[in-house]
């Protein structure tokens, strides 16, 4: 249903508050270096213009597309060339090429200062002095650091952020009330950003079909009582929502997400019995709740899949004449029966099935050829099961920090060309799979672990894409979305790697390490560990453990010393010498 004025349509649908917030997010995700005040000015100008269009949809420029309006506005920024360099060339293009150009310049790792949390009293004063600006600043700071953050979900985070300050700034112990809430929002926010980044990568790098396959599998697990037509409708709508958000069409995305939540709640009887509580909540909470809702119970009386997809002599006829429906139905039926499998495993099985049919349906005796296709699934299922079992045992034995260290060593040996900060960040996140998933019973471990690992490895892929340094990373990241984790798992030590030259500066530490939080201190130590492995990739576990134990003792000793700086200087030299000797550097 075409509207005379798209901007008026979205303004009316979303309301002024959400409209302004979403435009701010969109602008901050495109122009990540622009000061807050500049963005606020641009947003206010767009909002005033939208109001004129609401008043009269035939007014001048009101018929222009949102991309045209927003792009024109972004291109008025005076310092575009100085701040963004070649991104300024986007402004010479016409839509839709101009928007595509802006999208290509989104930076997953922008050169922005780390967000330092002010004192609680300072934050509460700022919140009370100007609540609106305070909350806008939150949206701006998150959006510019996470240019693919799911915009309607960021509105939900902002609502919780506001609620935290509203409650805690009047509490007796403000810090005790506020800080845990902010920590939780930060951690959840990072996880949400990474999950959405994978969705966008899936759409942008592997296409709509790949995303739809992922969505069919996930929604079939979540809504196993919903019939195929219902799941297909939800998949189509969800794909539209995520395509819009990943494409920078945040107003349309938020509007369509709200429509989808409304549809799901109106039709919950034919979708899932678990939606009742979600559907009683206000819009932002409702959408979030639906996205996180637990899997419904599997319906009774599901017959074996073998009859229709293996034993039937008409498989090739059905496949040839209705390829997408047949494969979609296979994935749906398999996924709804297997909430215990990861989505990526289900997609591997579907791909194996498709490949087998492609081969067998051209064979002399197709039925004889595909009769054993389900047997091919066995090793594909056992591989992640065994890997998770081994790694959970290792996690339980070592604890999170040492488990992360084991992964740091493992991944540095696999891809030593990758930058140290990236290896530390990715390995730390990989290591979190232990505390996140190993506590679950067997039936929930694989979907938790392997789908989480897909999200983390996508972080590695997007960071590496910005500055590619390893052919092995490029290969694992680009060949197959669903085989990324098995591809990285299969990598052995990179024998072609020339060890990094030893640089004493890398291993020089100062007294400032003593005032760091436990997390920051761990990161320092883990950075040193990566560098050690880069210098000595053939070092054994035992050698590395000895050096790291010495290092921990050194930090502990010097942090207790009266003259910390002198201790770090003198003992540090000794440690470096001892480490070199121990590792044969």
């Amino acid at each position: 249903d075409a509207h005379k004025s798209e901007v008026a349509h979205r303004f009316k649908d979303l309301g002024e508050e959400n409209f302004k917030a979403l435009v701010l997010i969109a602008f901050a995700q495109y122009l990540q270096q622009c000061p807050f005040e500049d963005h606020v000015k641009l947003v206010n100008e767009v909002t005033e213009f939208a109001k004129t269009c609401v008043a009269d949809e035939s007014a001048e420029n009101c018929d222009k597309s949102l991309h045209t309006l927003f792009g024109d506005k972004l291109c008025t920024v005076a310092t575009l060339r100085e701040t963004y360099g070649e991104m300024a060339d986007c402004c010479a293009k016409q839509e839709p090429e101009r928007n595509e150009c802006f999208l290509q310049h989104k930076d997953d790792n922008p050169n922005l200062p780390r967000l330092v949390r002010p004192e609680v009293d300072v934050m509460c004063t700022a919140f009370h002095d100007n609540e609106e600006t305070f909350l806008k600043k939150y949206l701006y700071e998150i959006a510019r650091r996470h240019p693919y953050f799911y915009a309607p979900e960021l509105l939900f985070f902002a609502k919780r952020y506001k609620a935290a300050f509203t409650e805690c700034c009047q509490a007796a112990d403000k810090a005790a009330c506020l800080l845990p809430k902010l920590d939780e929002l930060r951690d959840e926010g990072k996880a949400s950003s990474a999950k959405q980044r994978l969705k966008c990568a899936s759409l942008q790098k592997f296409g709509e079909r790949a995303f739809k396959a992922w969505a069919v599998a996930r929604l079939s697990q979540r809504f196993p009582k919903a019939e195929f037509a219902e799941v297909s409708k939800l998949v189509t709508d969800l794909t539209k929502v995520h395509t819009e958000c990943c494409h920078g069409d945040l107003l349309e995305c938020a509007d369509d997400r709200a429509d989808l939540a409304k549809y799901i709640c109106e039709n919950q009887d034919s979708i899932s019995s678990k939606l009742k509580e979600c559907c009683e909540k206000p819009l932002l909470e409702k959408s979030h709740c639906i996205a996180e809702v637990e899997n419904d119970e599997m319906p009774a009386d599901l017959p074996s899949l073998a009859a229709d997809f293996v034993e039937s002599k008409d498989v090739c006829k059905n496949y040839a004449e209705a390829k997408d429906v047949f494969l979609g139905m296979f994935l749906y039926e398999y996924a709804r029966r297997h909430p215990d499998y990861s989505v990526v495993l289900l997609l591997r099985l579907a791909k194996t099935y498709e490949t087998t049919l492609e081969k067998c349906c051209a064979a002399a005796d197709p039925h004889e050829c595909y009769a054993k296709v389900f047997d091919e699934f066995k090793p594909l299922v056992e591989e992640p099961q065994n890997l998770i079992k081994q790694n959970c045992e290792l996690f339980e034995q070592l604890g999170e920090y040492k488990f992360q260290n084991a992964l740091l060593v493992r991944y540095t040996k696999k891809v030593p060309q990758v930058s140290t900060p990236t290896l530390v960040e990715v390995s730390r996140n990989l290591g979190k799979v232990g505390s996140k998933c190993c506590k679950h019973p067997e039936a929930k471990r694989m979907p938790c672990a392997e789908d989480y690992l897909s999200v983390v490895l996508n972080q590695l892929c997007v960071l590496h894409e910005k500055t590619p340094v390893s052919d092995r990373v490029t290969k694992c990241c680009t060949e197959s979305l669903v085989n990324r984790r098995p591809c990285f798992s299969a990598l052995e030590v990179d024998e072609t790697y020339v060890p990094k030259e030893f640089n004493a500066e890398t291993f020089t530490f100062h007294a400032d390490i003593c005032t760091l939080s436990e997390k920051e201190r761990q990161i320092k130590k883990q950075t040193a560990l990566v560098e050690l492995v880069k210098h000595k990739p053939k070092a054994t576990k035992e050698q590395l453990k000895a050096v790291m134990d010495d290092f921990a003792a050194f930090v502990e000793k010097c942090c207790k010393a009266d003259d910390k700086e002198t201790c770090f200087a003198e003992e540090g030299k000794k440690l470096v010498a001892a480490s070199q000797a121990a590792l044969g550097l």
Partner: antibody
Framework: EVQLVESGGGLVQPGGSLRLSCAAS????????MNWVRQAPGKCLEWIGH???????YYATWAKGRFTISRDNSKNTVYLQMNSLRAEDTAVYFC??????????????WGQGTLVTVSS | FELTQSPSSLSASVGDRVTITCQAS??????LAWYQQKPGQPPKLLIY???DLTSGVPSRFSGSGSGTDFTLTISCLQPEDFATYYC??????????FGCGTKLTVL
């Protein structure tokens, strides 16, 4: 409520044609293979054919040529077109839902049936 | 393929254990269903995939077999169980076949 309702049965002369309808409610026909089964008075169940989720129709050997199954997803209805009817086609005609989109069985959901009488 | 059901009729008393067999002319793996039909009603699914009991069906009904030979057993016959029972073979192709039924009557 999930149900199937057949209609269109009645008295027809030998050599005549009839189109039976099966209207589904409470679920979407397009998700399932939809079957037609008949039962002559006091006789066995006899499968006629089905149309699957890929819109591919399959028929019992004896039904090919005279019987055609189709569906209209927008009306959530499946049809059985019967031509050149004979006295031995007299039966109650049931519509039944397959377990999945490409299933030939089992049939958990059945309509109540519609009687077709072929007689001069 | 064809399905041969036996016996074609059977008389029994309440409390009896009753067995009906169904033989396929070729292997159909475990793709066999059993239905109960009462006069004027459509068939009702009791067992699918040879031995899986449909939800809501009493546990006195059980199915067994695979390949070509299948059995439906009613362990302790109840008054409401007197009806005609059909087997159905499916899955070997996109066609399906019914047996010709076993009429179970009161002795």
């Amino acid at each position: 409520e999930v149900q199937l309702v057949e209609s269109g049965g009645g008295l027809v002369q030998p050599g005549g044609s009839l189109r039976l309808s099966c209207a589904a409610s409470g679920f979407s026909l397009s998700s399932y293979a939809m079957n037609w089964v008949r039962q002559a008075p006091g006789k066995c169940l006899e499968w006629i054919g089905h149309i699957n989720a890929g819109d591919i129709a399959y028929y019992a050997t004896w039904a090919k040529g005279r019987f055609t199954i189709s569906r209209d997803n927008s009306k959530n209805t499946v049809y059985l077109q019967m031509n050149s009817l004979r006295a031995e086609d007299t039966a109650v005609y049931f519509c039944a839902r397959g377990a999945g989109g490409f299933s030939t069985g089992p049939f958990k959901l059945w309509g109540q049936g519609t009687l077709v009488t072929v007689s001069s | 393929f064809e399905l041969t059901q036996s016996p074609s009729s059977l008389s029994a008393s309440v409390g009896d254990r009753v067995t009906i067999t169904c033989q396929a002319s070729e292997s159909i793996n475990s793709r066999l269903a059993w239905y109960q039909q009462k006069p004027g009603q459509p068939p009702k699914l009791l067992i699918y995939d040879a031995s899986d009991l449909t939800s809501g069906v009493p546990s006195r009904f059980s199915g067994s077999g695979s390949g070509t030979d299948f059995t439906l057993t009613i362990s302790c016959l109840q008054p409401e169980d007197f009806a005609t029972y059909y087997c159905q073979g499916y899955g070997g192709s996109s066609t399906t076949t019914f047996g010709c039924g076993t009429k179970l009557t009161v002795l």
